[in-house]
C-alpha cells in the first residue's frame, strides 16, 4: 500500500518545552522538535495530540512521514513547511484533527516530494484556491501530490462565510491545473449537495474517488468520461434517487471501475427502469444485491435486482384542477 507507516520504532522524544521556538540555525540532523517523537530509522516524526498551535520550525531534514494530528493549529500560513534546507524528503503529511480553519495560498510550497496529504477532520472555513497550487497562475507548476484526503473538512453551518463550500473545495482542487497527477481523492462526509460539473474532467489520473456520506442527490451533470484509470468510486450514504442513462453508460465505459452505491434512498418508480436493467447486467457495481428501494412507500425495502418493469410505475400526474391541497 502507499500509505505511510503510522507506527515507527526507536522514537526519541525531546524535552517538553519551547514548543514553538524559532531556530535561526538549520536544525541538527538528529534534532527532534519539542513535544514530538522522532525516528530517524523510520524517517518519521510524530507530534500527536500535543495542542501545538503552529508547525514546529525545527523539523529534522530527514523526515519522510510527518504526523501533526490532534493539535490546535488554526491557520496554515504560506510556506508553513518551508525550511532551509527544504524538507526535500517529506512524502506523507497528516494534519488531521488539528482544528485548522484556514489554509492559505502556498501553505504546502517547498515540499517537492509531498505525495500524500491528509487534512481530514478540520473545519476548513477558509481553504484558499491556491492552497495546493501555490500560485494564482492559470497553469501552475504540477503539484507532486498523488493522494489527497479531505474527509470531514466541512465547517459548522455558521462558519461557512456565506459561500458554497463545494465551490471553495473545488476551486482549490482545480487551481492552476496543479493536481493533474492526483490518483486518490477522498471527500467523504462533507455535506456536499452537488459536484460541480468540471471537477472530474480536470483530474484525469484519478484511480480512487471517495464521495461517500455526502448529500449528493444527482449525478446528472457530472461526467466520468475522461477518468480512464478510475478504479473505485464510493458513493455510499448519499441522497441519490436514481442514476440516469448517460451516467450509466459512462460508468460502464470505464474499463476498471467499481462503484459502491449502498445506503442511498433509491426511488423505485418509472424513472428507475433503465438503472434496474443496467444493474442486472453490469459487473461495475459492488454489492448490487444489497441495493433497496426507499420510495415510494409501497416499494420500501424491495431489492432493486428483483424488480421488473411492471413494478416500476409512475402515478399519473393529475391536472391542477384535480389535485388536492
Amino acid at each position: 500500500s502507499s500509505s505511510p507507516t503510522s507506527s515507527a520504532s526507536s522514537f526519541s522524544s525531546s524535552a517538553p518545552f519551547l514548543a514553538s521556538a524559532v531556530s535561526a540555525q538549520p536544525p541538527l540532523p538528529d534534532q527532534c522538535p519539542a513535544l514530538c517523537e522522532c525516528s530517524e530509522a523510520a524517517r518519521t516524526v510524530k507530534c500527536v495530540n500535543r495542542n501545538l498551535t503552529e508547525v514546529p520550525t525545527d523539523l529534522p531534514a530527514y523526515v519522510r512521514n510527518l504526523f501533526l494530528t490532534g493539535n490546535q493549529l488554526a491557520v496554515l500560513p504560506a510556506g508553513a513547511f518551508a525550511r532551509r534546507p527544504p524538507l526535500a524528503e517529506l512524502a506523507a503529511l497528516n494534519l488531521s484533527g488539528s482544528r485548522l480553519d484556514e489554509v492559505r495560498a502556498g501553505a504546502f510550497e517547498h515540499l517537492p516530494s509531498l505525495r500524500q496529504l491528509d487534512l481530514s477532520h478540520n473545519p476548513l472555513a477558509d481553504l484558499s484556491p491556491f492552497a495546493f497550487s501555490g500560485s494564482n497562475a492559470s497553469v501552475s507548476a504540477p503539484s507532486p501530490l498523488v493522494e489527497l484526503i479531505l474527509n470531514h473538512i466541512v465547517p459548522p453551518e455558521d462558519e461557512r462565510q456565506n459561500r458554497s463550500f463545494e465551490g471553495m473545495v473545488v476551486a482549490a482542487l482545480l487551481a492552476g491545473r496543479a493536481l493533474q497527477g492526483l490518483r486518490r481523492l477522498e471527500l467523504a462526509s462533507n455535506h456536499f449537495l452537488y459536484l460541480p460539473r468540471d471537477v472530474l474532467a480536470q483530474l484525469p489520473s484519478l484511480r480512487h474517488l471517495d464521495l461517500s456520506n455526502n448529500s449528493l442527490v444527482s449525478l446528472t451533470y457530472v461526467s466520468f468520461r475522461n477518468l480512464t484509470h478510475l478504479e473505485s468510486l464510493h458513493l455510499e450514504d448519499n441522497a441519490l434517487k436514481v442514476l440516469h442513462n448517460g451516467t450509466l453508460a459512462e460508468l460502464q465505459g470505464l474499463p476498471h471501475i467499481r462503484v459502491f452505491l449502498d445506503n442511498n434512498p433509491w426511488v423505485c418508480d418509472c424513472h428507475m427502469a433503465d438503472m434496474v436493467t443496467w444493474l442486472k447486467e453490469t459487473e461495475v457495481v459492488q454489492g448490487k444485491d444489497r441495493l433497496t428501494c426507499a420510495y415510494p412507500e409501497k416499494m420500501r425495502n424491495r431489492v432493486l435486482l428483483e424488480l421488473n418493469s411492471a413494478d416500476l410505475d409512475c402515478d399519473p400526474i393529475l391536472p391542477p384542477s384535480l389535485q388536492t391541497s
Epitope: S1, V146, S205, R258
Partner: antibody, heavy 116, light 113 residues
Framework: SVEESGGGLVQPGGSLRLSCAAS????????MSWVRQAPGKGLEWIGI???????YYASWAKGRFTISRDNSKNTLYLQMNSLRAEDTAVYYC????????????WGQGTLVTVSS | AQVLTQSPSSLSASVGDRVTITCQSS????????LSWYQQKPGKAPKLLIY???TLASGVPSRFSGSGSGTDFTLTISSLQPEDFATYYC?????????????FGGGTKVEIK
Amino acid sequence: SVEESGGGLVQPGGSLRLSCAASGFSLSSYWMSWVRQAPGKGLEWIGIIAGRGSTYYASWAKGRFTISRDNSKNTLYLQMNSLRAEDTAVYYCARVSSIYYTFNLWGQGTLVTVSS
Amino acid sequence: AQVLTQSPSSLSASVGDRVTITCQSSQSVYSNNELSWYQQKPGKAPKLLIYYASTLASGVPSRFSGSGSGTDFTLTISSLQPEDFATYYCQGSYYSGSGWYYAFGGGTKVEIK
C-alpha cells in the same frame, strides 16, 4: 502474503496451470501480475489482471498464456499452453500497489521445467 | 514494445563505494514517474526498493535513492554495504489506448571487488 503453486516438469507442447493463493488481503481489490525468470536470466513480465478482471499481456504471451482469478477462493491463476523449452523459469505472482503501478508484494515463486 | 535498457549489466565495487545504475526507456513511462527499482538476491524473490522514480519503499535504507523522469532514470547507493551485493532491476509501467504494459530492465549485478 502470496504463495505460488503448481509448478513442475511438463513436456513440450503440454499445458500447466499455476495458482497463486493470497492471504491477508482480498485479491479482487488489487491488480495482480505474473512475472517469470529463466535460470540465470532477468525478470520478464507476463501479464496483469485488473481489479474488475480486465487482462493485459506482454506481446509474446498473448494467445498462449491466460490470467484469471477466483475471488471466492482468493486465488490467481496462470494457464500456460503449448509450452516450449524456453518457458522453463521460476514463475512469480506479484501484487500491484493500489496507487502506484509497482509490484509491492511478491511470492517466492514456483519452478516450471519444460523438457522431454 | 517498450524496452528498458539498464547499464552497466554488471559492476564490481567495494564496501563504502558510491554506486550508480542507469535505466533508459524507449518511451516515456506512465506519468513520467512510474519507474520502480527492485533488488534480488540468489534464490529469492525480488524486493521493491524504490517506486514512483524516487520514493523509497517502506523499510528500505536511505542510502538508496532514485531520480529521473520520462525516459532516463538512476538508482544510487550512496555507500555500499555488504548486504547490498545483489542484482538490481528497473521496471517501467506504460499506458496506451490499448491498455497497460509493463517491462523490466535486463538487470545489473553488483559484485564484490
